[in-house]
């Protein structure tokens, strides 16, 4: 009896794993084996596919074959017993095009109100993604184990921190990778669950801000309790995309180690030009807080985005504010070569109720003021560029009294 060729051959490629599956054509014939050949583009001869010779099952793995993943290949299969079937040719394919991204590896670290997620490709030193390893982005689905209500988070990098969670609560999540450059979406990782810890008696420091004074950076933050020590760490922001890089390591700012105030001053030359992440941790000697939320710190903008300088012309029912370029040390104005938007906060000196105006113009009217009343004003600048979303610190407050009621404009 003539052996029939196997049919319906499927090629599954996940990362560097190449799997072939096929259907037997004749289930009634026993002791049949199957063998594959392959042919590279531009070649006439067929080569035996190692790992897929004389296979008794309907599945084989040819991952050991060192292929150029960008080069088209063709496969053929036949059945063998005493005689052999005719060859069945599989449509040619390019491994890279056919490949799926496998499930990433996930490592979780729990805080009381946050989870740190470390993601790395499932296949280390993958040949398939060798040119795209740094282009992976990830998305995740997270849910509270007790409720199952899912939240999706897209376009995250190899390290991501989810905040505003509840203490002592189990959260579950799964992660998948994507290569947007190649329109590839990967397979989800297994579900990972972790329980957030009991609430830390020491909250993390908050409202971290960087400003420039003379040739120094001044880093300030808020903290709930007194008599604490703080440490500050920094990281190159680009490394967040690639924790596999051996440079990925939070480092101490030497002048900000074990400081006893809620600020520290360090020379500008500590950082070369670039974008950094900063974080702060508090300790009372016995206990340690979790790390603060990280702030992005761009030396280029930070060096120039100083608080605006302004003059106030007082009328009976309004202030006219004229915003000028901030002064550097030496009283030279700073040239801002990117568009700014100004946030002006004002309040009655005897009250805490603040009002806010946001303006692109450098001359601003603050309306609806009461005559003969002291008002205070402070201002800060924001960049309008979304990519460089940065704010200066607020200027010092300037307080002025409005004129009597009948002042003409």
């Amino acid at each position: 009896k003539n052996l029939k060729s196997p049919q319906k051959v499927e090629v599954d490629i996940i990362d560097d794993n190449f799997i072939l599956r096929w259907n037997r054509s004749d289930e009634s014939v026993g002791n049949v084996t199957f063998s594959f050949d392959y042919q590279k583009t531009g070649m006439d001869n067929w080569i035996k596919l190692s790992g897929c010779q004389n296979i008794t099952s309907t599945k084989c793995n040819f991952s050991s074959l060192k292929l150029n993943v960008y080069e088209e290949i063709k496969l053929r299969i036949r059945a063998e017993k005493e005689n052999t079937s005719s060859w069945y040719e599989v449509d040619s394919f390019t491994p890279f095009r056919k490949a799926q991204i496998g499930p990433p590896e996930v490592h979780l670290e729990a805080e009381d109100k946050a989870i740190v997620i470390h993601i790395s490709p499932g296949t280390k030193d993958s040949v398939m993604w060798a040119l795209d390893g740094l282009s992976f982005t990830y998305s995740l689905v997270i849910w509270k184990n007790s409720s199952g209500v899912e939240e999706r988070i897209e376009n995250i990098y190899s390290r991501h921190k989810i905040y505003k969670l509840s203490p002592e609560t189990t959260y579950c999540l799964k992660v998948k990778a994507a290569l947007l450059t190649s329109w590839k979406i990967g397979v989800y990782s297994p579900v990972h669950c972790i329980k957030t810890t009991v609430e830390n008696e020491l909250p993390p420091p908050e409202n971290i801000e960087v400003s420039v004074q003379n040739q120094n950076y001044v880093l300030k933050w808020d903290y709930t309790y007194a008599n604490m020590t703080f440490q500050v760490q920094w990281l190159h922001a680009f490394l967040k995309r690639n924790p596999g890089n051996h440079l990925y390591k939070w480092k101490q700012i030497p002048d900000c180690e074990n400081v006893k105030t809620t600020q520290c001053v360090f020379p500008q030359n500590v950082f070369q030009k670039g974008i950094y992440l900063l974080r702060v941790q508090a300790s009372d000697g016995n206990n340690t807080s979790f790390w603060s939320e990280e702030i992005k710190f761009d030396t280029e903008i930070q060096a120039f985005l100083l608080p605006p300088v302004f003059n106030i012309r007082s009328l009976s029912d309004s202030f006219h504010i004229y915003i000028g370029a901030p002064k550097q040390s030496g009283n030279t104005p700073v040239i801002q070569d990117y568009p700014l938007i100004y946030e002006i906060i004002f309040w009655e000196n005897t009250s805490n109720a603040e009002r806010k105006i946001i303006e692109k113009k450098t001359d601003v009217t603050v309306p609806n003021l009461k005559p003969l009343t002291v008002y205070c004003v402070k201002a800060r600048a924001h960049t309008m560029d979304e990519k460089l979303n940065k704010s200066s610190v607020f200027s010092d407050a300037v307080c002025e009294k409005t004129k009597p009621g009948n002042t003409s404009k």
Epitope: V116, H118, R159, I194, T197, Y248
Partner: antibody, heavy 123, light 107 residues
Framework: QVQLVQSGAEVKKPGASVKVSCKAS????????MNWVRQRPGQGLEWIGK????????HFNQKFRDRVTLTVDKSTSTVYMELSSLRSEDTAVYYC????????????????WGQGTLVTVSS | DIQMTQSPSSLSASVGDRVTITCKSS??????LAWYQQKPGNAPKLLIS???TLESGVPSRFSGSGSGKDYTLTISSLQPEDFATYYC?????????FGQGTKLEIK
Amino acid sequence: QVQLVQSGAEVKKPGASVKVSCKASGYTFTSYWMNWVRQRPGQGLEWIGKIDPSDSETHFNQKFRDRVTLTVDKSTSTVYMELSSLRSEDTAVYYCARGGRISFDYDAALDYWGQGTLVTVSS
Amino acid sequence: DIQMTQSPSSLSASVGDRVTITCKSSEVIYNRLAWYQQKPGNAPKLLISGATTLESGVPSRFSGSGSGKDYTLTISSLQPEDFATYYCQQYWNKPFTFGQGTKLEIK
């Protein structure tokens, strides 16, 4: 697979120094902290310190700070622990143990251990 | 330094028994707790990290629980190969510290 292979047993006189090596294989050596732990005869475990093989940053148990030196040879993926001014109470098995990834935000458990090196201090 | 107090210091049990070992820390350690098993002449072996996460290859009869300052290792049904000394360790604050150990012996 991950392996940590330590140097052989040592006998030293009081006041001398000992240098124990720990050769790592099966993982990216510079991506994980390497810790040292000791165990005195019939006693529990005591953490000595740890080193980052990528840049040699160290952290020590205050108790050992003045007498212990941790070093790295990246070319051979080997970490060394040297203990000076030895006394009889330093007689112990010394273990190297892999800690967490350097990129982690917080410290991690010690997941792989060397086989241990017995250091005997005796006059 | 954070003190780790393990109890009991020794325990006699039979194959098939359910066994519980507890570990108390002098400060809150936020689940940064590991359990190790050590057999005579061998290095410790990590069983559980993060207070509850079973390491790969460790039998499911081992489980960890607890939070804050109080943590527990449970062996649901003792097997002959489980007779050993067990240590807890905190890795929340440096210096990392270990419990004094619990020796699990055959009754």
